[in-house]
């Protein structure tokens, strides 16, 4: 009876996500058979989050809307380890929008999920950000510095990275 009600709860939870994500990949967390964490297929997972590389080229605003439709946001990078995980799935000749912008052009950078911007945990390329007109952040590869962030015009279409919390069922 207990297992049956647990299964019913899981099914109803899965149904919630089905409109955005028809397929989930789930793994058992820890030793308890009752704890499963899921990411939409074919998203990748790292720690408590799921990531999706969007290869369609869109402006920053349209990229964020695209992530939002999937129940996600443009990626917020909180640690070096997280960035190191993300770059494994990126192409060196492409640029990808981050969930980081400065809409007022006053160098008050803000993350889309309201995570406080911490200057000590940023990975700007040297000399960046360097232009008050360029109010959105990308991550890209420079041969001299490898992967880092750069500021660019928000309306210029780029690829993007979406991030959402893992789904626990």
């Amino acid at each position: 009876n207990f297992m049956y009600s647990k299964t019913v709860k899981r099914l109803s939870k899965l149904r919630e996500y089905q409109q955005y994500h028809p397929s989930l990949t789930c793994v058992m967390e820890g030793k308890d058979i009752e704890d499963w964490s899921c990411c939409p297929t074919p998203w990748t997972s790292f720690q408590s989050s799921c990531y999706f590389i969007s290869t369609g080229m869109q402006s920053w605003t349209k990229s964020q809307k695209n992530c939002s439709v999937m129940g996600a946001d443009l990626v917020v990078i909180n640690t070096r380890e997280e960035q190191d995980f993300i770059i494994q799935n990126l192409k060196r000749n492409s640029s990808y929008f981050l969930g980081l912008s400065d809409p007022g052009g006053r160098r008050h950078w803000q993350w889309v999920d309201q995570t406080p911007y911490n200057e000590n945990v940023t990975f700007w390329h040297s000399g960046e950000p360097n232009n008050l007109d360029e109010r959105c952040a990308i991550i890209n590869f420079r041969s001299s510095e490898e992967w880092g962030w750069n500021d660019i015009h928000c309306h210029v279409p780029q690829k993007s990275i979406c991030k959402m919390k893992k789904i626990y069922i």
Epitope: Q58, S59, W60, T61, K62, Q64, K65, S101, P103, G104, G105, N130, N131, L132, D133, E134, R135, C136, I152, H153, C154, H155, V156, P157
Partner: antibody, heavy 121, light 111 residues
Framework: EVQLLESGGGLVQPGGSLRLSCAAS????????MSWVRQAPGKGLEWVST????????YYPDSVKGRFTISRDNSKNTLYLQMNSLRAEDTAVYYC??????????????WGQGTTVTVSS | DIVLTQSPDSLAVSLGERATINCKAS??????????VNWYQQKPGQPPKLLIY???NLESGIPDRFSGSGSGTDFTLTISSLQAEDVAVYYC?????????FGGGTKVEIK
Amino acid sequence: EVQLLESGGGLVQPGGSLRLSCAASGFTFSTYTMSWVRQAPGKGLEWVSTINSGGDNTYYPDSVKGRFTISRDNSKNTLYLQMNSLRAEDTAVYYCATYRPYYYGSVLDYWGQGTTVTVSS
Amino acid sequence: DIVLTQSPDSLAVSLGERATINCKASQSVDYDGNSYVNWYQQKPGQPPKLLIYGASNLESGIPDRFSGSGSGTDFTLTISSLQAEDVAVYYCQQSDEDPWTFGGGTKVEIK
């Protein structure tokens, strides 16, 4: 007072090249993103190119990508548009304009008087 | 690309009367409460002049008989009391996503 003065237009044969210039004064040119916009005879406006203040980022629509190159010399307060492999459909008045950001978008707030490019055999 | 469709193509209005121009975008050009549509005026033989930015903000130095409204995909430029010097072609433009695109223009004349 902001002033933008385009030059370099003229008559050129299809497949030929032209280099347009836009001399800027009355503002700190080196801190402004700049754009070119064109207008074919009796037609509407078409964005042609944009370059950021440092000159390291340039943008084009598909219609001119690979044929036109925007550049700037901040020491001379001058914006350029190098146009190669010209076609009849490139015939237009070419305007340079200053770019002003507006949150995630932008406006083109000051425009020059334009220079006329005619591509014809 | 985002297509902007202006209507009407031309408009004849009596002096002192209201002129209304519409601009419809093929997809939303809004984000976070702002609309990325601008309006320009172009008189014969002159370059375009910025009137309205962000759908409804009046550019400095522009008479307040000009106003803009709308959001999402539908935008309007209104001249509340047409003056002789307002005879021109008016263009909407979106700056939400490259390539920036312009509407086809609306010619405003005196009736």
